[in-house]
Structures are given as C-alpha cells and as structure tokens.
C-alpha cells in the first residue's frame, strides 16, 4: 500500500481466484483513543472499532472511503483504491491500446520543435468517474524538471457502437537546451483512476524521436509563362525552431490527381520552392521533416492547381 495523495491510498493486489488479498492497517487521524467506530462508503453498517483497524482487501467491494466516527461525528477519512496485477502484469483496463507505433502503446507524444515543449494524448471509452494526473522528468535516477499542465478532454469520436474520448496534456521541459544532444530520455507518467481502480501508464522518449513539424505555411503557386509548369513556394511553419539555418527542414512536394488511383508525382527538396507540372483538377501538397533526423513528416499543406 502507498499514498497517492493526502488520505488516498493505493492497494496493490495480485488478482486471481481466491487470492488472499492484502492486510491493510487503517489509523484514525484523531487524538481520541476510545469510542471510535469505522464505516465503509455510504453504509451505516459498522465494520469495526478502535483507533486502528486491520482490514483484508481482496476485491473492489473492499475499496472505497473508510470513515472513522465518534458519537456521530466524523473524525477522518481514508480512500482506498485498487491496483490489479494479473499474471504478474499490471492491469491496463482504463486506456485503449493505440497499437501505433507498436502494440501496448497507451500514451502517444509529439513535439512541434526542439523547445522542450511536447503534447501527449491517450484514448479511453470511459466517460465518467475518471481522473488523470501527469508527471514528467528528464531521466529517472537524477530527474530534471518537466512541468505538465492538467489533462483535458480534447476530442470525442464515435467508433461503431462506442464513443471514444481523447485526453491530452502539454508539458514543458524546465531548462530545455534545443541544440543539445539528448542523452537522457523524457519520462512521462500518467496516473489514471476510474471509480476505485488505479492504473499507471508510462512513456519514455527523446524529443528528437517525437518531432513532428507543423505543415509548411503560405503555400502558393506561380504559373510559369508558356508552360504547364508552376513554381510552388512555401515557408517554414511558425512553430519550427530557429534559426532555420541550424534547425533545417526538408520537404516533399506531391502532385495528386482528383482520383486517388492516379499516379502521384513526388519531388524532394531542401529549398522552400519547387517547379512541378500542374495537371487539371490536381492538387499540390507539401509536407516537412527534420532535415538531419528521420522523425515524423508533418501533415500535408495543400492548394488546388486550378
């Protein structure tokens, strides 16, 4: 058993049929010594008496708010949550496996640049009685500070018969050095509580591996005289790290016909312009990637040829 926050405790349980559970000692936070009784949740049924109470915790019916009383007055509360371990593996019932980039990916994180700011998100089908708390650091043995905000509901989607809820959080490394080579990974830890169930999820990464630039901005076409060719130009996204001479991007320019089956023409360039043939009813799209490190491509920025 360990304390999650004041008066809230997590009991770690091996979860299998007829498991003995854990014996937990509760102490009433009071100078009183006598006439103390204990109840669980809203029940008026008395569980026991005395300043300390030893309880066996082996199912969700044993979790909840334990209250000690004297003469009708509430003295203190202890909320017990359960953390289940089945076959040596902690439960992951609350969050959905996003399966990308690999199985058992519950948290996904992205950064738009090297400033030390990043966003993480996760999915659940649970809509009520759900709380999240996020902590982060760089390294774990001698951790350096990363400050995370509160997790917020960022999207709702309907998937078949189910509703899916996306939560996200923004974090900022306290003393980020954008140009430095990372040697210690960022650690992100999410505590999830659904009703009386506790779970925790972690992710470990280098900022360089989660970089995904915003799409190029100000995408423009300039027809070339007496030609089907156009000059496509664009700019670095505002959110990308500066100076651009050091934090350089490479770009992919794509000409895509109206039909998805039509052959795509692609050009790769380090410049912020390119010359391509603009077919009727086609569109031109440009995306960006870090020039020196193969992290994710940005989403496409697009304009029609017409």
């Amino acid at each position: 058993i360990w304390e999650l926050k004041k008066d809230v405790y997590v009991v770690e349980l091996d979860w299998y049929p007829d498991a003995p559970g854990e014996m937990v000692v509760l102490t009433c936070d009071t100078p009183e010594e006598d006439g103390i009784t204990w109840t669980l949740d809203q029940s008026s049924e008395v569980l026991g008496s005395g300043k300390t109470l030893t309880i066996q915790v082996k199912e969700f019916g044993d979790a909840g708010q334990y209250t000690c009383h004297k003469g009708g007055e509430v003295l203190s509360h202890s909320l017990l949550l359960l953390h289940k371990k089945e076959d040596g593996i902690w439960s992951t019932d609350i969050l959905k496996d996003q399966k990308e980039p690999k199985n058992k990916t519950f948290l996904r994180c992205e950064a738009k640049n090297y400033s030390g700011r990043f966003t993480c998100w996760w999915l659940t089908t649970i809509s009520t009685d759900l709380t999240f708390s996020v902590k982060s650091s760089r390294g774990s043995s001698d951790p350096q500070g990363v400050t995370c905000g509160a997790a917020t509901l960022s999207a709702e989607r309907v998937r078949g018969d189910n509703k899916e809820y996306e939560y996200s959080v923004e974090c900022q490394e306290d003393s980020a050095c954008p140009a430095a080579e990372e040697s210690l990974p960022i650690e992100v830890m999410v505590d999830a509580v659904h009703k009386l169930k506790y779970e925790n999820y972690t992710s470990s990464f280098f900022i360089r591996d989660i970089i995904k630039p915003d799409p190029p901005k100000n995408l423009q076409l300039k027809p070339l005289k007496n030609s089907r060719q156009v000059e496509v130009s664009w700019e670095y996204p505002d959110t990308w790290s500066t100076p651009h001479s050091y934090f350089s991007l490479t770009f992919c320019v794509q000409v895509q016909g109206k039909s998805k089956r039509e052959k795509k023409d692609r050009v790769f360039t380090d410049k912020t312009s390119a010359t391509v043939i603009c077919r009727k009813n086609a569109s031109i799209s440009v995306r960006a990637q870090d020039r020196y490190y193969s992290s994710s491509w940005s989403e496409w920025a697009s304009v029609p040829c017409s």
Epitope: G21, E45, L47, I55, Q56, K58, E59, G61
Partner: nanobody, 115 residues
Framework: EMQLVESGGGLVQPGGSLRLSCAAS????????MYWFRQAPGKGHEWVST????????AYADFVKGRFTISRDNAKNTLYLQMNSLKPEDTALYYC????????RGQGTQVTVSS
C-alpha cells in the same frame, strides 16, 4: 426464528490455540456481515473481528495482531474464529452477532487462558 449458538471455548495455556464455532439458523450468514465480540470479566464488550459478504473479506481489532482468523462455511451456515498464540488477557466470553448492535447474538462461549 434467527438463532446463533457458539461452541469451542475452554481452558487453554498461554500460547495455545482454540477454534470457536458459531452455528446460525433462521438466516444465511453469507448474506450478512458477521461479527465476533468478547466481554472480559468486569469489562464492556469489545469488538474482535468482522467478515463481510461477497468474497468474505475480513477486519480485525488492533489487539488481534495477526493471531486470530475469522472465516465461514456457507454450506454449514457456520462462522469460525481460529485463535492462536493466546494470552491471559484474551480471557473473556466470546460471542458472535449478526449486526453491530447485537440484536441477533448468541449466548457466548467462555475462553480462559491460564497456566
């Protein structure tokens, strides 16, 4: 009529063991929280242990300190209290009850711990 009958008490030396039984009739113990209490000579009654419904999770008074185990046999409709490492201060009348107030309780079984 709801009835509880305790048995298994007796005289035992310090460090010894006893197993108390509480046979219930007129109701099912598996559907109720069940309690053991005790009353030492010249003292008030004292809660010892509780067993809950469902998986039968348990609770114990501080003085028990791992020495006693409450259990039940639903088929026999009987509640038990296994008492080990008994001390002279465990000498008391032990009784079972269907509720905290003791509105349904047995007559008790005497436990004496003495050398």
């Amino acid at each position: 009529e709801m009835q509880l009958v305790e048995s298994g008490g007796g005289l035992v030396q310090p460090g010894g063991s006893l197993r108390l039984s509480c046979a219930a009739s007129g109701f099912s113990i598996s559907n109720n929280w069940m309690y053991w209490f005790r009353q030492a000579p010249g003292k008030g009654h004292e809660w010892v242990s509780t067993i809950k419904t469902g998986a039968g999770s348990t609770a114990y008074a501080d003085f028990v300190k791992g020495r006693f185990t409450i259990s039940r046999d639903n088929a026999k409709n009987t509640l038990y209290l296994q008492m080990n490492s008994l001390k002279p201060e465990d000498t008391a009348l032990y009784y079972c009850a269907r509720d905290w107030a003791g509105t349904v309780r047995g007559q008790g079984t005497q436990v004496t711990v003495s050398s």
